[in-house]
C-alpha cells in the first residue's frame, strides 16, 4: 500500500493551524470499515490520532488534532493540527493499514516571526565623540533561533564587540538580545537585522547617534522615528524618553500619553504618582525608570484597533511632546489550495484554483506564478474580508486552462512583516484527481 506525504517540511506559524497531508490509494470497493489509520510521533511512537473499526477514535494529542472524515474514503488521511506550539515540531508518521499496510513520515517545522527590534543606548544622553556606547537590539517571541547581523550606515558589517543571547520562554519562543559596543564618531547609524532562518523573515531597526548636548530649558522628548510594529495579541512598548535636569523629582512630572488624533487619554502620571490606564486597562508605565527619564508605555494584548499615533507629552517646568506610531500586524497562515473541479481533469479543461490564507493584518498582497516562476496576472480575483477583530481572510481565485501538466503557486505577502506565505499545487497526468490519489 502506497502512502504519500509531502517531501518538504510543513511550515506552521505558532498559534495557527497546520495540515499534515497524507494520502493513500483505496482499491475499488474499499470501505472505511476496513481502514486502520494511525498518526503517531515518529521518534517516540506516541499516538496522536487514529481511525479504526469504521470510526474516528479521536485525538490522543491534547485534543488539538482532527482528521478530514468526509475525505477519508477517497484516500485523504491528512491530519489537522490546531493552535500549533513550538513543542509540536518534529516528525509525524502516517500509518495506513487496509489489507496491506504502508506508512510515511512528514516533518512539521514550527516558526514564529520576530518582532521589529527595539534599540536602546547606554548611556543615552550627553554623548560626545569618543564616548563608548552600548547599543542593545532586542527582538521578541520568534522561533526558531534567529541570526543577528549588525552593520553601519554604509552597510559595512560590524562583527567585533558583539554579544548575542537568545532565551526561550515557557512556550519555547525566543527573545533575542544582541549587544554592540562602539566608540562614537561625529555621528553614526547602527543597524541591527534579526533573521528568522525558516521564514526567511528579516526584522530590522537602526539608531542614528548624533553626539551633542541638549539645550537647557526645554524638555526634549524623544521617540523612535520608525513605527513600532507589534503583532496582534503580543505586548508593545511605545518608547519615549526625556532628559531630566539635575535635582529632578517625580513630584514635578506631568506625563500624559494620549491618542494623537482624538486626544483621548491613554495613561498618565501626575501629582507624583501613576494615575493608571484610561485605555481598557491595557497600558502600563515603567515606574522604576521614570526618574531616569524613561516615559515609555507598555501596551498589552495589542489589537488591530490600537493602530495609530500616540503622543507622549511631558511637562516639568517647560513641556515637550512627540508622537510615536504603532503599526499592528498579524502573520498570514500558510495558504490552503483548492481546485474546482477537482477530479477527472484533462488538458484543455478550465479549472478554478482558490488560494486561501487567514487572519493576517494589514491587507495582503497576493501573487500567482507558474512552475517557471512566470507571474500569472490574468483571470485573478482576490477578495479580503476583515473579521470582528479586524484581521483579514484572503481568498484569491485563479482561472486557468490546463496544459499537459503544470504547477501553480500562490504567494500571500504581509507588507508590514515582509512575511511571505506560499502554497502551490501541481497538476500532472491525464486524467487525474486532486488531491492526488497515488
Amino acid at each position: 500500500l502506497e502512502v504519500q506525504v509531502p517531501e518538504d517540511p510543513v511550515v506552521a506559524l505558532v498559534g495557527t493551524d497546520a495540515t499534515l497531508c497524507c494520502s493513500f490509494s483505496p482499491e475499488p470497493g474499499f470501505s472505511l470499515a476496513q481502514l486502520n489509520l494511525i498518526w503517531q510521533l515518529t521518534d517516540t511512537k506516541q499516538l496522536v490520532h487514529s481511525f479504526a473499526e469504521g470510526q474516528d477514535q479521536g485525538s490522543a494529542y491534547a485534543n488539538r488534532t482532527a482528521l478530514f472524515p468526509d475525505l477519508l474514503a477517497q484516500g485523504n488521511a491528512s491530519l489537522r493540527l490546531q493552535r500549533v506550539r513550538v513543542a509540536d515540531e518534529g516528525s509525524f508518521t502516517c500509518f495506513v493499514s487496509i489489507r496491506d499496510f504502508g506508512s510515511a513520515a512528514v516533518s512539521l517545522q514550527v516558526a514564529a516571526p520576530y518582532s521589529k527590534p527595539s534599540m536602546t543606548l547606554e548611556p543615552n544622553k550627553d554623548l560626545r565623540p569618543g564616548d563608548t556606547v552600548t547599543i542593545t537590539c532586542s527582538s521578541y517571541q520568534g522561533y526558531p533561533e534567529a541570526e543577528v547581523f549588525w552593520q553601519d550606515g554604509q552597510g559595512v558589517p560590524l562583527t567585533g564587540n558583539v554579544t548575542t543571547s537568545q532565551m526561550a520562554n515557557e512556550q519555547g519562543l525566543f527573545d533575542v538580545h544582541s549587544i554592540l559596543r562602539v566608540v562614537l564618531g561625529a555621528n553614526g547609524t547602527y543597524s541591527c537585522l534579526v533573521r528568522n532562518p525558516v521564514l526567511q523573515q528579516d526584522a530590522h531597526s537602526s539608531v542614528t547617534i548624533t553626539p551633542q548636548r541638549s539645550p537647557t530649558g526645554a524638555v526634549e522628548v524623544q521617540v523612535p522615528e520608525d513605527p513600532v510594529v507589534a503583532l496582534v495579541g503580543t505586548d508593545a512598548t511605545l518608547r519615549c524618553s526625556f532628559s531630566p535636569e539635575p535635582g529632578f523629582s517625580l513630584a514635578q512630572l506631568n506625563l500624559i500619553w494620549q491618542l494623537t488624533d482624538t486626544k483621548q487619554l491613554v495613561h498618565s502620571f501626575t501629582e507624583g504618582r501613576d494615575q493608571g490606564s484610561a485605555y481598557a486597562n491595557r497600558t502600563a508605565l515603567f515606574p522604576d525608570l521614570l526618574a531616569q527619564g524613561n516615559a515609555s508605555l507598555r501596551l498589552q494584548r495589542v489589537r488591530v484597533a490600537d493602530e495609530g499615533s500616540f503622543t507622549c507629552f511631558v511637562s516639568i517646568r517647560d513641556f515637550g511632546s512627540a508622537a510615536v506610531s504603532l503599526q499592528v500586524a498579524a502573520p498570514y497562515s500558510k495558504p490552503s489550495m483548492t481546485l474546482e473541479p477537482n477530479k477527472d481533469l484533462r488538458p484543455g479543461d478550465t479549472v478554478t484554483i482558490t488560494c486561501s490564507s487567514y487572519r493576517g493584518y494589514p491587507e495582503a498582497e497576493v501573487f500567482w506564478q507558474d512552475g517557471q516562476g512566470v507571474p500569472l496576472t490574468g483571470n485573478v480575483t482576490t477578495s479580503q474580508m476583515a473579521n470582528e477583530q479586524g484581521l483579514f481572510d484572503v481568498h484569491s481565485v485563479l482561472r486557468v486552462v490546463l496544459g499537459a501538466n503544470g504547477t501553480y503557486s500562490c504567494l500571500v505577502r504581509n507588507p508590514v512583516l515582509q512575511q511571505d506565505a506560499h502554497g502551490s499545487v501541481t497538476i500532472t497526468g491525464q486524467p487525474m484527481t486532486f488531491p492526488p490519489e497515488a
Epitope: 539645550p215 530649558g217 526645554a218 514635578q252 494620549q258 487619554l265 494615575q275 517646568r317
Partner: antibody, heavy 119, light 108 residues
Framework: EVQLVESGGGLVQPGGSLRLSCAAS????????MSWVRQAPGKGLELVAT????????YYADSVKGRFTISRDNAKNTLYLQMSSLRAEDTAVYYC????????????WGQGTLVTVSS | DIQMTQSPSSLSASVGDRVTITCRAS??????LAWYQQKPGKAPKLLVY???NLADGVPSRFSGSGSGTDYTLTISSLQPEDFATYYC??????????FGQGTKLEIK
C-alpha cells in the same frame, strides 16, 4: 522685574495677514514656554497658541490651526504670532504670557495688543 | 479637548459676603487648575494655581479647593476691589489649556 510687551496689532482686512511680537525682559527667556491668549470684545479668554522653550513643540487652538504660527527667537528674547487668512472672529486683544513651572498657571501677562479684522 | 464649565455666569453680592464660584472639567484634571481675576481694560491676574495654592501677593480671603473634575474659588469676605470677572483654566494634558467662560461678580 518680568516684563512682556506686545506690538504689531492694528486694523486688517478679512483674508489679510499680521505679525504680532512680544518683547520679553527680566527673566531668562530661553528657559520658559510662552503662550498667546486672546479675548474678543465682551467675551472670555481663549488660549490661541503655545510654544516650548526651545521652539521645538507648538500647539494651537482648533479655531486658528493652519492659519496662525507661533515662533520665537531666543537670541532676541522675542515671541511671535504670525496670523494669516484673518477673519472677523479673530478680532480681539492678544496677550503674550509666560508659561510657569508645571501647574503654576500663567503668572505674567503683557498689556495686550488689539487686532481688528474688518473691511 | 477638555471643556471647562463655570457657574454661575454672573453673580450679585455685597461687600462682606462669602462668595463661591465653581468650575467643572469634562474629565479628571488632577488639580491642574488655575483661577484668574480680570478687571475691565486690564490683563488677567493669577490668583490660585494647582487648585489650592495662592499666587504671590494674593490676599488670604481668596482660597481654592477641589479635586478630580470639580473645583471651587471662594472669597470669604468680599471687598470693593474684588468686583471683577473670574476665570478658571486647566493645565492638564496637551495644550491648548482651555478657560472657563467666566463669572462676572457684580455689586448688589
Amino acid at each position: 522685574e518680568v516684563q512682556l510687551v506686545e506690538s504689531g496689532g492694528g486694523l486688517v482686512q478679512p483674508g489679510g495677514s499680521l505679525r504680532l511680537s512680544c518683547a520679553a525682559s527680566g527673566f531668562t527667556f530661553s528657559s520658559y514656554g510662552m503662550s498667546w491668549v486672546r479675548q474678543a470684545p465682551g467675551k472670555g479668554l481663549e488660549l490661541v497658541a503655545t510654544i516650548n522653550s526651545n521652539g521645538g513643540t507648538t500647539y494651537y487652538a482648533d479655531s486658528v490651526k493652519g492659519r496662525f504660527t507661533i515662533s520665537r527667537d531666543n537670541a532676541k528674547n522675542t515671541l511671535y504670532l504670525q496670523m494669516s487668512s484673518l477673519r472677523a472672529e479673530d478680532t480681539a486683544v492678544y496677550y503674550c504670557t509666560r508659561n510657569e513651572e508645571f501647574r503654576r498657571g500663567l503668572a505674567y501677562w503683557g498689556q495686550g495688543t488689539l487686532v481688528t479684522v474688518s473691511s | 479637548d477638555i471643556q471647562m464649565t463655570q457657574s454661575p455666569s454672573s453673580l450679585s453680592a455685597s461687600v462682606g459676603d462669602r462668595v463661591t464660584i465653581t468650575c467643572r472639567a469634562s474629565e479628571n484634571i488632577y488639580s491642574n487648575l488655575a483661577w484668574y481675576q480680570q478687571k475691565p481694560g486690564k490683563a488677567p491676574k493669577l490668583l490660585v494655581y494647582a487648585a489650592t495654592n495662592l499666587a504671590d501677593g494674593v490676599p488670604s480671603r481668596f482660597s481654592g479647593s477641589g479635586s478630580g473634575t470639580d473645583y471651587t474659588l471662594t472669597i470669604s469676605s468680599l471687598q470693593p476691589e474684588d468686583f471683577a470677572t473670574y476665570y478658571c483654566q486647566h493645565f492638564w494634558g496637551t495644550p491648548p489649556w482651555t478657560f472657563g467662560q467666566g463669572t462676572k461678580l457684580e455689586i448688589k
